[in-house]
């Protein structure tokens, strides 16, 4: 996966970092106080398609194969940059009962980007 | 995840069989000849976007809460119906060396969509 | 280098409080969070609780809530802890220690020795 | 709570030797623990996080397995500066936990 140098506009991934105090969560995750979520940005012409790499890799070939041949409705099928990578991340926090809890939450973090 | 009935244009997930012989992967695939990959289709208006459910939910529920507030540069960037929950599923096929393995290829069904 | 430098020892009376500071350097303090734990002579180590700069929590251990208070001032970078209703048995050495990842207590103050007698 | 156990509660041995600690947990805690070393009137000192992640600057002769509810810190070749106490600690759930300690003393 690429990583935005500001230099192309391909489908890459962005550096971001979450401050859960800006989003209002801080009254109910209590650590960390923010974090490198990062996200994905960027054209997907369809030659980058399915480009392998990205963990949908096998499906988004396949139906690439439909799209770049012009197979309906694919041909309208807009490939989009989306996350194809993400870490979970350790968060200690105040569940419904106000137990606290500490969990690895799945899906936190973007590491790599792709094209659907 | 939503399944696509014709009655919505909300990000769902639309049956599709694909054909091995089709794509000219019959070759090298042994079995099966096709199977259901399906495919994600469908707007992502801001408010469904990151919904729950999602395998990219805490994430995209995060960015969502940016792009809500209109925070540069996430107000212009888009929602994405992509698959959220993919299945693997058996493969026999040749490799490289003319050699017949069976395995389990990631991510090869769409099992659910949702809005990145 | 990263430090934790904590305030001298105290000879308290039953029933008094004592507080305890600690001032951090060499990181940026509301990065990570600051947790007591306490060490009885000739036993072992007991966490007392945490207090998070970041998010503005602390988190206690049931069996001191109540009875402790953990405080920050993030102008002079300093985590404090307060005992109070002190007894014979909070006799101990109180260290401060940085969270490197949560719950985990990756560098540590030299300790703080508490005596409680009357 | 998560009760930490640990065993021995002393060990005695001499330089070269290999040394092994257990410790066990009242429930599952994966791979969320750590092991710290405190020689007399010192602070204690992080040297496994993670049940088998080496903290920077600690000797490789130091090593770290397990999860679940078992694990173990091994010495492979005991030298001098390591004779202290040992100390896991879980680092799962809230309150994190600690177990009574290793004394590893000199035979």
């Known amino acids: 996966g690429l990583e935005c140098d500001g230099k192309v506009n391909i489908c890459c991934k962005k550096q971001f970092f979450v401050s859960f105090k800006d989003i209002g969560w801080n009254d109910w995750i209590i650590a960390p106080s923010g974090y490198h979520a990062n996200y994905c940005e960027g054209e997907c012409p369809s030659h980058i398609a399915g480009t392998s790499g990205s963990s949908l890799s096998f499906h988004s070939t396949v139906i690439n194969h439909y799209r770049m041949r012009g197979h309906s409705p694919f041909a309208n099928l807009k490939s989009c940059c989306v996350p194809t990578k993400l870490r979970p991340m350790s968060m200690l926090y105040y569940d419904d009962g106000q137990n606290i809890i500490k969990k690895d939450i799945q899906n936190m973090i973007v590491e790599e980007c792709g094209c659907s | 995840g939503l399944e696509c009935d014709g009655k919505v244009n909300i990000c769902c997930k639309k049956q599709f069989f694909v054909s091995f012989k089709d794509i000219g992967w019959n070759d090298w695939i042994i079995a099966p000849s096709g199977y259901h990959a399906n495919y994600c289709e469908g707007e992502c208006p801001s408010h469904i976007a990151g919904t729950s459910g999602s395998s990219l939910s805490f994430h995209s529920t995060v960015i969502n809460h940016y792009r809500m507030r209109g925070h540069s540069p996430f107000a212009n960037l888009k929602s994405c119906c992509v698959p959220t929950k993919l299945r693997p599923m058996s493969m026999l096929y040749y490799d490289d060396g003319q050699n017949i393995i069976k395995k389990d290829i990631q991510n090869m069904i769409v099992e659910e969509c949702g809005c990145s | 280098q990263v430090q934790l430098v904590q305030s001298g020892a105290e000879v308290k009376k039953p029933g008094a409080s004592v507080k305890v500071s600690c001032k951090v350097s060499?990181?940026?303090?509301?990065?990570?969070?600051i947790s007591w734990v306490r060490q009885a002579p000739g036993k072992g180590l007991e966490w007392m609780g945490g207090i998070y700069p970041g998010s503005g929590h602390t988190i206690y251990a049931q069996k001191f809530q109540g009875r402790v208070t953990m405080t920050e001032d993030t102008s002079t970078d300093t985590a404090y802890m307060e005992l109070s209703s002190l007894k014979s048995e909070d006799t101990a050495v109180y260290y401060c220690?940085?969270?490197?990842?949560?719950?985990?207590?990756?560098?540590w103050g030299l300790g703080t020795a508490v005596t409680v007698s009357s | 709570d998560i009760q930490m156990t640990q065993s021995p509660s002393s060990v005695s041995a001499s330089v070269g030797d290999r040394v092994t600690i257990t410790c066990r947990a009242s429930?599952?805690?994966?791979?969320?623990l750590a092991w710290y070393q405190q020689k007399p009137g010192k602070a204690p000192k992080l040297l496994i996080y993670d049940a088998s992640k080496l903290e920077t600057g600690v000797p490789s002769r130091f090593s770290g397995s397990g999860s679940g509810t078992d694990f173990t810190l091994t010495i492979s070749s005991l030298q001098p500066e390591d004779f202290a106490n040992y100390y896991c600690?879980?680092?799962?759930?809230?309150?994190?936990?600690f177990g009574g300690g290793t004394k590893v003393e000199i035979k």
């Open positions: 220690a940085r969270e490197g990842d949560i719950f985990v207590m990756d560098v």
């Open positions: 600690q879980q680092a799962k759930s809230f309150p994190p936990t």
């Open positions: 429930m599952d805690i994966r791979n969320d």
């Open positions: 060499g990181y940026t303090f509301t990065s990570s969070a």
